[in-house]
Interface confidence: medium
């Protein structure tokens, strides 16, 4: 993809409509509000010539200098250029794909989004009214000969004689010419070395680089051919009727041949490369919905076959600023919720044959991350958060809540800025993630904040599996397992014994594992066992033994 | 993260040549203009060239034309100064510039190389 | 060639101030002008885009306004990083920098 800032910026204030493109020598006039950069010269119509093999080398006569055109929304009108600047700052383009200048109303497109605006529109086809592409990568032409920029009351008469020839690889403005500047600072213009002789020239030599706008219509599917003279000329065999040739099928080479009463045999013969079909092309948004936030795709598609040649069509897109020379584009790093302006053309041997213009709106980005303000837990079995909302814009929140490898999210509504988390788990770490999501064209998760609580202590659960065994006639061997649920910091298991209604023995142990010795013979025993975790007693697990009589 | 770093600056004897080179990462190198600006030592800023994503079209002031020329390779996502019959007055801190996508003026700036010109 | 007039040179401030940095064109610019922000040994780094647009990361008291020759850069409550000198630069034909205002703190 190469985009292009364009160089020469053009005032679209005095033109009633935008052409789009320029075809090739003497070209057209590029109007446009102005784009950058580096090519632009402000307040100055500029054209350009077309870069292609055979015109590397033209001579430029004064009557094609007086022909610019432009398309026209309406049709094709005739746009009278103002002076060219003088490029003092040189420009030194080489043969590549870059389009030179650009000067596009989409350099204005709103870098904001627009309320209640559809989030693509589409402008399809012949006539719409979009940005203007020059047509060459190398040197604008002038189409009148104004030095202007060189003027100034203070500078004496002079006369200079400068005789180049013009080429597609040069930078300035180049024919032949006999400049005088006068004091008042306007500049003259003899045309003593341009026509030594006042014979009529050929119409050949005459109309050596006439250009052509095709404009198609799509009821009859056929082009019809507008010749960029000024004058009313004469086609052979009455082929055109005020400068247009009507009734050319698509893909078909027509042969037209032009006189005019101001020139001389031989005539110009005009031969017209007709291009495809407006409606075989139709301008795609291929932009992947994943990325449609930040990312535009746009291609052209062969929707129909034709028997051009594929070879000789070129795709141009201008999307803000940038200028690119590819059938499809993908812009990347844009902002969301943003519109962004594309004008495109296609062209065939350079000539512009179909436009379109998009504003496609990015979809809505990731919502930004919410700012935690407090989560903590006062309780054993709850907890709660506190936050503010993201910035941009989205639709609701998840909260997840994570204790060890356990996870449970809900889904909260878009209002909520506080949340009560019940049923928690004594004594537990939770690490909560709180993020916001958008459903756009795809579901798009914003950053997750994240925070952590340990929930307050509770009573740990009973002890279980206690068995008291008998192991002399007056010992007892007391065990048990742990309770499921600690719910506290610490652990220390706990054995009382009771004979009647009064406590005999009160041990404490890291393990559930107690020997009782020196008991009474032949007494009815209360082993209670249960499990305390620094804060908390658990309830206590109850079995009954009772000690033999003694065996001595 | 876009990074642009020059490198290839260094003192020089008026009226040799120099090459600067600039390795860009973190963006699509191929679809973006660039242009190198210059800096005098605690002074303003003054662009020296530009090139298009491309290659295929190229700027300059008058100040350097004829005797600068920029260029990139694409693959290496490099850009290049080529600067010769150089002159005390082109000393200065080179900066490799990556334009902006939409406007056309330079988003992102490397840390720039320094080129002193004296005999 | 487009001349850019940048005023003050030089501009001493308060913490918390509003302060304006104001570049003028020699001709109509169509809204194509920059704004950088330069501290002492660093690369320039860009703040405004085309006349109004803040660039991705850049804090919102910046701000930037214009239109045709007249174009202002507004800092509306001034902090301690934001000591720096400030460019213009217009990019409608070419581009070409305003001199620079060096901001420090009062």
């Known amino acids: 993809q190469s985009p292009t800032p364009s160089p020469t910026g053009l005032t679209t204030a005095k033109m009633p409509s935008v052409p789009l493109s320029s075809d090739p020598l003497p070209t057209h006039t590029t109007a446009f509000s102005p784009a950058s950069t580096f090519e632009r010269e402000n307040d100055f119509s500029e054209t350009t010539t077309s870069l292609s093999p055979d015109n590397t080398s033209t001579q430029v006569s004064p009557d094609s200098l007086d022909n610019a055109s432009a398309f026209n929304t309406t049709g094709v009108s005739s746009v009278q250029t103002p002076h060219l600047p003088t490029h003092a700052d040189s420009q030194t383009p080489s043969a590549g794909t870059d389009t030179q200048t650009f000067s596009g109303s989409a350099a204005n497109a709103k870098l904001n989004p627009t309320p209640g605006s559809n989030a693509i529109s589409d402008v399809p086809g012949e006539r719409s009214t979009a940005s203007t592409f020059p047509t060459d990568p190398v040197s604008p032409l002038t189409t009148t000969l104004s030095l202007a920029h060189h003027s100034s009351a203070a500078l004496p008469a002079r006369t200079s004689n400068t005789t180049i020839t013009a080429n597609t690889s040069d930078a300035y403005l180049n024919a032949s010419e006999t400049t005088t500047l006068s004091p008042s600072g306007s500049a003259v213009i003899s045309t003593t070395t341009i026509a030594t002789t006042p014979s009529k020239p050929t119409c050949d030599e005459k109309y050596a680089n006439i250009t052509v706008d095709y404009l198609y219509n799509k009821e009859t599917k056929l082009f019809t051919a507008k010749l960029n003279v000024n004058e009313n000329v004469e086609c052979g065999n009455n082929t055109c009727t005020n400068n247009e040739v009507h009734n050319l099928t698509e893909c078909k080479n027509a042969s037209v041949s032009i006189s005019h009463n101001s020139c001389t045999a031989p005539d110009k013969t005009l031969i017209l490369d007709v291009p495809p079909g407006v409606e075989k092309f139709q301008l795609h948004d291929c932009t992947q919905v994943e990325k449609a936030d930040t990312t535009i795709c746009l291609k052209w598609k062969n929707i129909e076959t034709f028997t051009c040649d594929t070879q000789n069509i070129t795709y141009r897109f201008q999307c803000g600023n940038m200028i690119f020379d590819n059938k499809e584009i993908k812009l990347e790093n844009l902002e969301p919720e943003h519109e962004y302006k594309c004008d495109s053309e296609i062209l065939y041997n350079n000539h512009k044959f179909t436009n379109a213009s998009k504003i496609i709106k990015t979809d809505f980005g990731s919502p930004g991350e919410p700012q935690i303000i407090f989560c903590r837990s006062e309780a054993a079995h709850q907890g709660v958060i506190t936050w503010n909302p993201p910035q941009r814009s989205f639709h609701n929140f998840t909260l997840c809540y994570i204790k060890e490898t356990e996870k449970d999210c809900l889904n909260l509504d878009k209002n909520l800025i506080k949340y009560d988390l019940q049923n928690l788990k004594p004594y537990t770490k939770y690490v909560l993630s709180l993020h916001a999501y958008i459903i756009a064209k795809v579901q798009r998760n914003g950053s997750a904040a994240m925070c952590h609580f340990t929930t307050k202590s509770a009573p740990p659960s009973q002890v279980w599996n206690m068995t008291v065994s008998m192991t002399s006639d007056n010992s007892m061997h007391v065990k048990c397992r742990p309770p499921r649920d600690r719910n506290g910091p610490h652990e220390r298991y706990h054995l009382e014994v009771e004979a009647g209604n009064t406590l005999v023995r009160n041990e404490s142990h890291k393990n559930c594992d107690f020997r009782v010795k020196d008991l009474q013979y032949s007494t009815d025993y209360t082993f209670k066992a249960y499990f305390h975790n620094g804060d908390y007693p658990g309830e206590p697990f109850i079995l009954h033994h009772s000690t033999s009589y003694n065996s001595k | 993260e876009v990074q642009l770093v020059e490198s290839g600056g260094d003192l020089v004897q008026p009226g040799r040549s120099l090459k600067l080179s600039c390795i860009a990462s973190?963006?699509?190198?191929?679809?973006?203009?660039m242009t190198w600006i210059r800096q005098v030592s605690g002074k303003g800023l003054e662009w020296v060239a530009s090139i298009s994503s491309s290659g295929g079209s190229i700027y300059y002031p008058d100040s350097v034309k004829d005797r600068f020329t920029i260029s990139r390779d694409n693959a290496k996502n490099t850009l290049y100064l080529q600067m010769n019959s150089l002159r005390s007055e082109d000393t200065a801190t080179y900066y490799c510039?990556?334009?902006?996508?939409?406007?056309?003026?330079?988003?992102?700036w490397g840390q720039g190389t320094s080129v002193t010109v004296s005999s | 060639d487009i001349q850019m007039t940048q005023s003050p040179s030089f501009l001493s401030a308060s913490v918390g101030d509003r302060v304006t940095i104001n570049c003028k064109a020699s001709?109509?610019?169509?809204?194509?002008l920059d704004w950088y922000q330069q501290k002492h040994g660093e690369a320039p780094k860009l703040l405004i885009h085309?006349?109004?647009n803040l660039h991705t990361g850049i804090p919102s008291r910046f701000s930037g306004s214009g239109s045709g020759t007249d174009y202002t850069l507004t800092i509306s409550s001034l902090q301690p990083e934001d000591v720096a000198t400030y460019f213009c630069l217009q990019h409608s034909s070419r581009w070409t920098f305003g001199g620079g205002t060096k901001l420090e703190l009062k």
């Open positions: 973190g963006f699509t190198f191929t679809n973006f203009w």
């Open positions: 001709q109509n610019i169509n809204k194509y």
């Open positions: 085309y006349t109004n």
């Open positions: 510039v990556k334009l902006h996508y939409y406007s056309g003026g330079g988003d992102a």
